[in-house]
């Protein structure tokens, strides 16, 4: 069988949801010594980067200026060491946002609930769209989808304190073109049905995989590079539509 290098890791820097006309940055984390990285969009070659010097850095950044709906879709990357190519990375879905209009997010029965109450979010957008998306801040990969003509329901079921946090919704014109985000709704969930004093919301952190982790080589890193790369490939959970 034809020998290939381990697949690289593709990430979006800061977020995979990019407002239109803003710059998207994708990182391809491969291996020290890689002489060429290729970014593929919808299966076709989109851009090429050659790190300098190749043996000192384990990946590259691809800058995609002036984001629009034609550049939104599925990206992947590969890299080359000498004449040997890597396997293709997982697919990364790059979404363009701030298209057209802004939806309204609402929550029943209210923004303050007790653990065990049934909560439903509603996303409403009067312009022509049929798919709606609900995201919790700090969990942008956990996208919930729902369908409706001008409004979609997102039943959360009986909530727990794990549901605390800030939510936004989008209308989607296709899988990769989303509306402006709604204003946020902060859901406060108190511990039990009797105690209705307000509890603080859990801290939210940006998605750890929405960060580029490219490193310049030091002496020790070279020995660890292949092990580290293989381990990250093994543990990396990727978002799919």
């Amino acid at each position: 069988p034809k020998q290939t290098l381990p697949k690289p890791i593709i990430r979006a820097e800061s977020t995979y949801m990019v407002p239109k006309e803003k710059q998207a940055t994708l990182c391809c984390q491969g291996s020290y010594g890689a002489v060429e990285y290729q970014l593929h969009f919808e299966g076709s070659l989109f851009a090429v980067e050659r790190p300098k010097p190749p043996e000192r850095i384990n990946g590259v950044k691809f800058h995609i200026p002036d984001m629009n709906s034609r550049k939104a879709g599925r990206y992947s990357c590969i890299y080359r060491v000498g004449e040997l190519w890597s396997e293709r990375s997982d697919l990364l879905d790059l979404v363009v946002t701030e298209m057209y209009d802004t939806p309204t997010l609402s929550v029943h029965p209210g923004p303050e609930v007790t653990s065990g109450e049934k909560v439903t979010f509603y996303c409403r957008l009067d312009t022509a769209t049929s798919m709606f998306l609900l995201l919790k801040e700090g969990r942008s990969r956990d996208v919930q989808r729902s369908y409706g003509k001008v409004q979609a329901e997102f039943p959360m079921g009986p909530v727990t304190t794990a549901h605390r946090g800030s939510y936004r919704c989008f209308g989607s014109y296709n899988n990769y073109a989303w509306s402006f985000p709604s204003e946020p709704v902060k859901l406060l969930v108190t511990g039990d049905i009797e105690n209705t004093s307000l509890a603080p919301t859990d801290p939210t952190f940006p998605d750890s995989w929405d960060t580029c982790l490219l490193t310049r080589e030091t002496g020790l890193q070279k020995d660890l590079a292949l092990w580290d790369h293989t381990a990250q490939n093994h543990h990396h959970h990727h978002h799919h539509h």
Epitope: L105, S106, H108, P109, E117, R168, I193
Partner: nanobody, 121 residues
Framework: QVQLVESGGGMVQAGGSLRLSCAAS??????IHWFRQAPGKEREFVAR????????FYADSVKGRFTISRDNTENLVYLQMNSLKPEDTAVYYC????????????????WGPGTQVTVSS
Amino acid sequence: QVQLVESGGGMVQAGGSLRLSCAASGRTFNTIHWFRQAPGKEREFVARIWWIGGATFYADSVKGRFTISRDNTENLVYLQMNSLKPEDTAVYYCAADARYTSHGYYESDYWGPGTQVTVSS
């Protein structure tokens, strides 16, 4: 035809009590909320109850003084208001299946016309 009608408002001395009623007809609802609006102020949430199960929730400003309850057979929701204060003076509204929006207010397709509560000192 869906209808919500409040009753039971009136004038009362500070420290007194009133019981408001909300009669719901025309369909079944998940929740009934009570709101109030004082002159020159925004409408504010007071309390809510689930038709099924009867779970309740109160605004901090009325907790321990107001009690919301329901009579499923009569399709009535009550707001028992004790230890009334002058700052409780407002028009009280009931609403069905109200939702809090990202614009910072509650919306509902079904509101009652309201009942006036005046608490004098």
